[in-house]
């Protein structure tokens, strides 16, 4: 009878993570008597996967009944495959012996490759907000995929971006891989409602790419424009001055009125109106009792937005000659939270 050969018919097997891998092995003869063992890898550091004779291998099942003498099919199934299971598996025939069985012949090996899906891409933006016209960086990360080939694209509001750099690690062979990409995005005043999208395509996703998003509302700061105007006289000795704070984002804003450089009132933006582009408008007004002033008054609307250095706009209030009335030093009644009398 011809000498036993160990046949592993599959040079490679590709399995999706979580599925079962079947590793095929047959012998051409029933002699010599002795067990079959399966190993991952070769040489002294090889890892025992299954031993026909003894041991507990909960993930491994045999395709046929290996207890029988007449069996020549030593194929096994390995359940719940993970990327860590990738490698070359050898079916090895031993000859019965003492004190140990003697390795007799090995199969040529079957390379198990594991297809593992990438994790959901995580997009993160800069730690601090930035203003329009500035360029900010976004990063996208996805992990645990195999094989290594992967495609990553960036979009802003559906428009593909071109200014990005991508790395897949590690460079050499590995059981699974990670991708890291950094994209540069120029902010505009209209970006409060904008989204940056990182899209990852991989063979395991069957043409349905994974997406990670970042809202530019978390990144952008649109500084306000200020306009101070004097309204028509409400009463003979009162002037209404308004400060229009327009097109700002985020909402966090504090406004201080100064009269000739002295703090008159400070308030926080509360009842704001939202523009279509996502920015906010707010208005504060001041009721000025001009009869209390002999000289012109410089009114300043000072705004501190989102913890940034204050910006201000001033208005010179002309005090024309007029008779001083009795009780002019008496405070006029406040008619609203945004009103202030100066006397």
């Amino acid at each position: 009878e011809e000498e036993l050969q160990v046949i592993q018919p599959d040079k490679s097997v590709l399995v999706a993570a979580g599925e079962t891998a079947t590793l095929r092995c047959t012998a051409t003869s029933l002699i010599p008597v002795g067990p079959i063992q399966w190993f991952r890898g070769a040489g002294p550091g090889r890892e025992l996967i299954y031993n026909q004779k003894e041991g507990h291998f909960p993930r491994v099942t045999t395709v046929s009944d290996l207890t029988k003498r007449n069996n020549m099919d030593f194929s096994i199934r390995i359940g719940n495959i993970t990327p860590a299971d990738a490698g070359t598996y050898y079916c090895v025939k031993f000859r019965k012996g003492s004190p140990d069985d003697v390795e007799f012949k090995s199969g040529a090996g079957t390379e198990l490759s594991v297809r593992a899906k990438p994790s959901a891409p995580v997009v993160s933006g800069p730690a601090a907000r930035a203003t329009p016209q500035h360029t900010v960086s976004f990063t996208c990360e996805s992990h645990g995929f195999s094989p290594r080939d992967i495609t990553l694209k960036w979009f802003k509001n559906g428009n593909e971006l071109s200014d990005f750099q991508t790395n897949v690690d590690p460079v050499g062979e590995s059981v699974s891989y990670s991708i890291h990409s950094t994209a540069k995005v120029v902010l505009t005043r209209e970006d409060v409602h904008s989204q940056v999208i990182c899209e990852v395509a991989h063979v395991t996703l069957q043409g349905d790419p994974l997406r990670g998003t970042a809202n530019l509302s978390e990144t952008i700061r649109v500084p306000p424009t200020l306009e101070v105007t004097q309204q028509p006289v409400r009463a003979e000795n009162q002037v209404n001055v308004t400060c229009q704070v327009r097109k700002f984002y985020p909402q966090r804003l504090q406004l201080t009125w100064l009269e000739n450089g002295n703090v008159s009132r400070t308030e926080t933006a509360s009842t704001v109106t939202e523009n279509k582009d996502g920015t906010y408008n707010w208005m504060s007004w001041l009721l000025v009792n001009v009869s209390a002033h002999r000289d012109d008054v410089k009114l300043t609307c000072q705004v501190e937005h989102d913890g940034q250095p204050a910006v201000s706009k001033s208005h010179d209030l002309k005090v024309s000659a007029h008779p001083k009335e009795q009780g002019s030093n008496t405070a006029a009644e406040n008619t609203g939270s945004n009103e202030r009398n100066i006397y």
Partner: antibody
Framework: EVQLVESGGGLVQPGGSLRLSCAAS????????MHWVRQTTGKGLEWVSV???????YYAGSVKGRFTISRENAKSSLYLQMNSLRAGDTAVYYC????????????WGQGTMVTVSS | DIQMTQSPSSLSASVGDRVTITCRAS??????LAWFQQKPGKAPKSLIY???SLQSGVPSKFSGSGSGTDFTLTISSLQPEDFATYYC?????????FGQGTKLEIK
């Protein structure tokens, strides 16, 4: 049903010959090593001989040169030709199948009695 | 030849008892050890192979352990049908050899 049935035992004079047969059924006979084991009255078991799948043979020292094991796969039959019989060969002879992957015996026949006496 | 020595030669026990029979080989036999049960006038019955693997159809009250030269057969809860003679056998190399047997008797 897997079965082994021995036959051919009997009374024989010292120096005589006897041929034992073992008829196998219920399995692919050619795929198994087959053994003969004997048991003397009131004594323990003694392995006698084996014939492998490829026809290779081995014998216990006490029977070497006197006994010959053979098989006929087409008939699913195992044989033991016993020559130059001695009184010490008196025993119940069993055939057994090396049915496990490691050639452990899994199936035994019911036995046939061989008596060597003058 | 490899010598197989069983102990004890005989053992008295009661129904429900747990009993252990030991078998020692004169040299390392890896774990190629089998156990057989034989009742008077009957052929031996295979119980265990490769030290601890149960033959098909053998109840799990029988268990085997050991390696190298020292082996044991344990019957966890004796039933009337378990009173018999038990043999160990090495089959790592020819000639295969048996122990002299342990007769398990009812107390």
């Amino acid at each position: 049903e897997v079965q082994l049935v021995e036959s051919g035992g009997g009374l024989v004079q010292p120096g005589g010959s006897l041929r034992l047969s073992c008829a196998a059924s219920g399995f692919t006979f050619s795929s198994y090593d087959m053994h003969w084991v004997r048991q003397t009255t009131g004594k323990g078991l003694e392995w006698v001989s084996v014939i492998g799948i490829a026809g290779d043979t081995y014998y216990a020292g006490s029977v070497k040169g006197r006994f010959t094991i053979s098989r006929e796969n087409a008939k699913s039959s195992l044989y033991l030709q016993m020559n130059s019989l001695r009184a010490g060969d008196t025993a119940v002879y069993y055939c057994a199948r090396g049915g496990n992957w490691d050639d452990a015996f899994d199936i035994w026949g019911q036995g046939t009695m061989v008596t060597v006496s003058s | 030849d490899i010598q197989m020595t069983q102990s004890p030669s005989s053992l008295s026990a009661s129904v429900g008892d747990r009993v252990t029979i030991t078998c020692r080989a004169s040299q390392d036999i890896n774990n190629y050890l089998a156990w057989f049960q034989q009742k008077p006038g009957k052929a031996p019955k295979s119980l265990i192979y490769t030290t601890s693997s149960l033959q098909s159809g053998v109840p799990s009250k029988f268990s085997g352990s050991g390696s190298g030269t020292d082996f044991t057969l344990t019957i966890s809860s004796l039933q009337p049908e378990d009173f018999a003679t038990y043999y160990c056998q090495q089959y790592v190399s020819y000639p295969y050899t048996f122990g002299q047997g342990t007769k398990l008797e009812i107390k």
